[in-house]
């Protein structure tokens, strides 16, 4: 669940998620609305969609704890756990590397962004 995600994002990006990403823009952190503000925000919007899909599949996205290995900068999702746990790991792995890919466009001004300013059409999944 959330502990896995925090640890994974820290390992991959080198940033403390609680200080750098939760919240950030209009979609990083709990909830999400409006048009994503930048590429980093798009990572989180896509991750929300990934979680939404798993919810429709009956997975407990915040409760399920999965196993994974982090070595030489890569994440390997373990095939030990249940289907839901493995898919959850895949969602989190994707967002972690997406955030890393977009570190160069990270904007400090979007940290703790005021959500009422998040306007426009929320992208569909």
């Amino acid at each position: 669940g959330i502990l896995n995600l925090n640890k994974m994002v820290k390992q991959v990006t080198g940033k403390m998620p609680i200080l750098s990403y939760w919240p950030y823009g209009c979609h990083c952190g709990l909830g999400g609305r409006g048009q994503p503000k930048d590429a980093t925000d798009w990572c989180c919007q896509t991750h929300d969609c990934c979680y939404d899909h798993l919810k429709t599949q009956g997975c407990s996205i915040y409760k399920d704890y999965y196993r994974y290995n982090f070595s030489q900068g890569n994440i390997h999702c373990s095939d030990k756990g249940s289907w839901c746990e493995q898919q959850l790991c895949a969602c989190d792995k994707e967002v972690a590397f997406c955030l890393k890919r977009n570190l160069d466009t990270y904007q400090k001004r979007l940290r703790f962004y005021w959500r009422p300013h998040c306007r426009g059409q929320t992208p569909g999944c």
Partner: antibody
Framework: QVTLKESGPGILQSSQTLSLTCSFS??????????VSWIRQSSRKGLEWLAH???????RYDPSLKSRLTISKDTSRNQVFLKITSVDTADTATYYC????????????????WGTGTTVTVSS | QIVLTQSPAIMSASPGEKVTISCSAS?????MYWYQQKPGSSPKPWIY???TLASGVPARFSGSGSGTSYSLTISSMEAEDAATYYC?????????FGAGTKLELK
């Protein structure tokens, strides 16, 4: 040829600890992704998965029984063990050990080879 | 945990008859696995990943389903098919089994 064979006390008293052994051949628990589960079967509750141990000593338990279960292994002797504490008559069952199938799909989790089972009776 | 409900609990079929055994999950599962068990023997893997027959399983058996509804079908019942069939899931932890369907020869 892969085989598994369970052994246990047969009969024991309520409140005692049940110790079971699964001796296997034809595969090694040091092989990556390999794992063995304990499953029991009773007329009251049907088939009930209890615990699973992986090649790297990672363990999983049925949450409703977790506090009473301990699974362990001796890789060199090709054995897996299960301990159940504070047994009562509800633990009367046939106990099986079974190997998790090594599938091409990581998300598969089923059992391709089962032991013959050992019958355990708990008397009050 | 996900509860698997099998129906019917007991059924009988004549040789040559088509047989369908159902397994209903209390919430969505990705795949279903099936085992066959005969009296005095341990369960044998029968169908995995919903529809793939295990090694040595006759082609008259098939598996299908998605979501919460799965089934095992025998196109033409034979005497050796008389057994108890169990479904199993590991979509979410913990792994669970159905209570079984006992198939008898009429």
């Amino acid at each position: 040829q892969v085989t598994l064979k369970e052994s246990g006390p047969g009969i024991l008293q309520s409140s005692q600890t049940l110790s079971l052994t699964c001796s296997f051949s034809g595969f090694s628990l040091s092989t990556s992704r390999m794992g063995v589960s304990w499953i029991r079967q009773s007329s009251r509750k049907g088939l009930e998965w209890l615990a699973h141990i992986y090649w790297d000593d990672d363990k999983r338990y049925d949450p409703s029984l977790k506090s009473r279960l301990t699974i362990s292994k001796d890789t060199s002797r090709n054995q897996v063990f299960l301990k159940i504490t504070s047994v009562d008559t509800a633990d009367t069952a046939t106990y099986y050990c079974a190997r998790r199938a090594l599938s091409d799909y990581g998300s598969d989790f089923y059992f391709d080879v089962w032991g013959t089972g050992t019958t355990v009776t708990v008397s009050s | 945990q996900i509860v698997l409900t099998q129906s019917p609990a007991i059924m009988s079929a004549s040789p040559g008859e088509k047989v369908t055994i159902s397994c209903s999950a209390s919430s969505i599962v990705s795949y279903m696995y099936w085992y066959q068990q005969k009296p005095g023997s341990s369960p044998k893997p029968w169908i995995y990943r919903t529809s793939t027959l295990a090694s040595g399983v006759p082609a008259r058996f098939s598996g299908s389903g998605s979501g919460t509804s799965y089934s095992l079908t025998i196109s033409s019942m034979e005497a050796e098919d008389a057994a108890t069939y169990y479904c199993q899931q590991y979509h979410t932890y913990p792994l669970t089994f159905g209570a079984g369907t006992k198939l008898e020869l009429k």
